[in-house]
Interface confidence: low
């Protein structure tokens, strides 16, 4: 069959469905893309105007390609094999209920069934595989494909080279000893410690030197790139995910369904917009969250804030501030404060920096 | 090999409450979801309530919802579930069961079983 | 809720006879169905989940096939220990629901 003889593939979103936010239908279907370039050298880029490769259109009854659609239920969406012209394009029943979640069709599952169609795939015999003809809702926290997927897609564009991971040609891995490099995030989960930074994260266990550098999307494919603040709770392997306003729960290594949730759930003022930094005290049972040059201090056991806040970060931070990138707890009296390619390590019981080093000094640079 | 033993049944006045406890062992019980199902005498099985691995989520059968709360304490592998404001409908024996996942394109299942506890609810 | 119905309630079969007992869903469940058996008296225990997979130590004599909204569990040659009552059940919506339940008995 035909498949796209290129890398670099093109799509645009033509219409939006009305059952969802614009927002919501955007994010499915680039991570039902990314499903896709995650095991394959493929890259896809999403465009707003012009001729691209794949053109996603939601469309109710006769459309203009013969295959009419058939009101709700039954066929929920089509799409044809790579080429010119409609070539690619992935067409969405309307009269479908498009949801986020299980109630209605999953769009984002059914639109990794259509791309699968839509980069050559045809339907698979395995019950278990994404492009077994019958629609199954699954929980899409921990969606991946099957071996039968890969295998099919792998057969058709190779699988993907180390130098060809990133979806996105011009976000390459940052030089881990770069002296200027920065991180969006970092946190303890259990021994290791995640450095998050664009869409990568690196994982420093416990005293060894050896980092090794991960998409985030090869950990948890649901999630986006961009993490911006994260804290851990390991008494309830718990790890806590930020990103704008929406925060993912991570437990056990494993995504929780019914995510992300809007961060004012914690009892955020309507104005914070993003969190910075958190971090989680397991001594007092409290989690610092940084937003600007304010923090607030969030009580897990009783799921309030604290009253009294937010506070100024240069008042209660000796030396820390006015704001700050990421933050971890560790060895039980220190917080590590990141500040562009500068880390400090503050003793909380003493309330001050006890040492000044570069952010990357944990990887031995 | 992988047990559950249920504890805590016994006969209840209506509208009284009662603690049940499921103590596992022969698994990682932190990395699976958890259950509780009943069995009225004589009659068929319902489910009554699911607790996720980490404890942050949990669901409840309709006719349970409100009264009864599953809790789970990983660190001494512990499942319970409080039963308050008990009706005599609630008679049955309660059995505490693992969940597992087969893959991501098929459902939990109970692949282990406590033998389970009576709660009788009786004036 | 999904509901559940099984077909027979009770039935009676002689030793070696082969046994079919059907389970019918009030919507389409896909492949999100899962069989128990329960000896008189003791808990149930997993026999097949996800329409035709054997549990762990699951004689082969069981098997499961189906799909949608009809599914079958078949007993290849009924043994005495076979005796009890079997359940279907889903999981493709919560509350997951059962079978009203099989009664199997030797003739």
């Known amino acids: 069959g035909p498949v796209w003889r290129k890398h670099y593939i093109t799509y645009r979103i033509n219409n939006y469905t009305p059952d969802m936010n614009r927002e919501d239908v955007d994010y499915a279907i680039r991570k039902a893309f990314q499903v896709w370039s995650n095991v394959t050298p493929l890259k896809f880029s999403k465009i707003n105007t012009g001729m691209a490769d794949i053109l996603v259109v939601f469309a109710r009854g006769a459309h203009g390609d013969f295959h009419a659609f058939d009101g709700k239920g039954g066929i929920l969406a089509h799409a044809f094999g790579p080429g010119s012209g409609i070539g690619g394009d992935a067409h969405f029943d309307e009269d479908e209920f498009w949801t986020t979640h299980s109630g209605g069709t999953n769009l984002f599952l059914t639109a990794v069934h259509e791309i699968g169609h839509s980069l050559g795939l045809g339907h698979s015999s395995d019950p278990k595989a994404v492009m077994f003809p019958t629609y199954k809702y699954v929980d899409i926290n921990t969606f991946r494909l099957s071996a039968d997927d890969i295998r099919g897609i792998q057969s058709l564009y190779g699988d993907p080279k180390e130098n060809q991971r990133l979806p996105n040609p011009d976000n390459s891995e940052p030089a881990l000893c770069d002296p200027n490099l920065s991180f969006d995030a970092v946190t303890t989960v259990g021994n290791k410690i995640f450095f998050f930074k664009d869409r990568f994260f690196w994982l420093k266990v416990s005293e060894r030197p050896k980092t090794s550098v991960n998409l985030i999307s090869s950990l948890w494919p649901t999630l986006p790139s961009g993490i911006e603040a994260a804290y851990e709770i390991e008494a309830r392997n718990q790890v806590f995910l930020f990103k704008d306003d929406k925060y993912w729960l991570i437990s056990n290594l494993r995504p929780e369904p019914n995510y992300p949730k809007s961060i004012h759930s914690f009892g955020f003022p309507n104005f914070v917009k993003k969190i910075d930094a958190a971090v989680f005290n397991p001594r007092f049972y409290r989690t610092y969250f940084f937003v600007d040059n304010q923090y607030w201090r969030y009580d897990e056991r009783r799921q309030m804030m604290d009253p009294g806040y937010p506070k100024l970060i240069t008042k209660n931070f000796q030396g820390i501030g006015p704001k700050i990138d990421a933050v971890f707890y560790s060895k039980n009296k220190y917080y590590y404060f990141f500040q562009g390619s500068n880390q400090f390590e503050y003793d909380f019981l003493l309330q001050r920096i006890t040492k000044t080093l570069k952010s990357n000094s944990w990887f031995g640079c | 090999e992988v047990q559950l033993l249920e504890s805590g049944g016994g006969l209840v006045q209506p509208g009284g409450s009662l603690r049940l406890s499921c103590a596992a062992s022969g698994f990682t019980f932190s990395e699976y979801q958890m259950a509780w199902v009943r069995q009225a005498p004589g009659k068929g099985l319902e489910w009554v309530s699911s607790i996720y691995p980490s404890g942050g989520h949990t669901h409840y059968a309709d006719s349970v919802k409100g009264r009864f709360t599953i809790s789970r304490d990983n660190s001494k592998n512990t499942l319970y579930l409080q039963m308050n404001s008990l009706r005599a409908e609630d008679t049955a024996v309660y059995y505490c069961?693992?969940?597992?996942?087969?893959?991501?394109?098929?459902?939990?299942?109970?692949?282990?079983w406590g033998q389970g506890t009576l709660v009788t609810v009786s004036s | 809720d999904i509901q559940m119905t099984q077909s027979p309630s009770s039935l009676s079969a002689s030793v070696r006879d082969r046994v079919t007992i059907t389970c019918r869903t009030s919507q389409n469940i896909n492949t999100y169905l899962n069989w128990y058996y329960q000896a008189p008296g003791r808990a149930p225990k997993l026999l097949i989940f996800g329409v035709s997979s054997l549990h762990r130590g699951v004689s082969s004599r069981f098997s499961g096939s189906g799909d949608g909204t009809e599914f079958t569990l078949t007993i290849s040659s009924l043994q005495p220990e076979d005796i009890g009552t079997y359940f279907c059940q889903q999981s493709y919506s919560s509350p997951w629901t059962f079978g009203q339940g099989t009664k199997v008995e030797i003739k």
């Open positions: 069961a693992k969940e597992s996942y087969y893959d991501f394109w098929s459902g939990y299942y109970f692949d282990y």
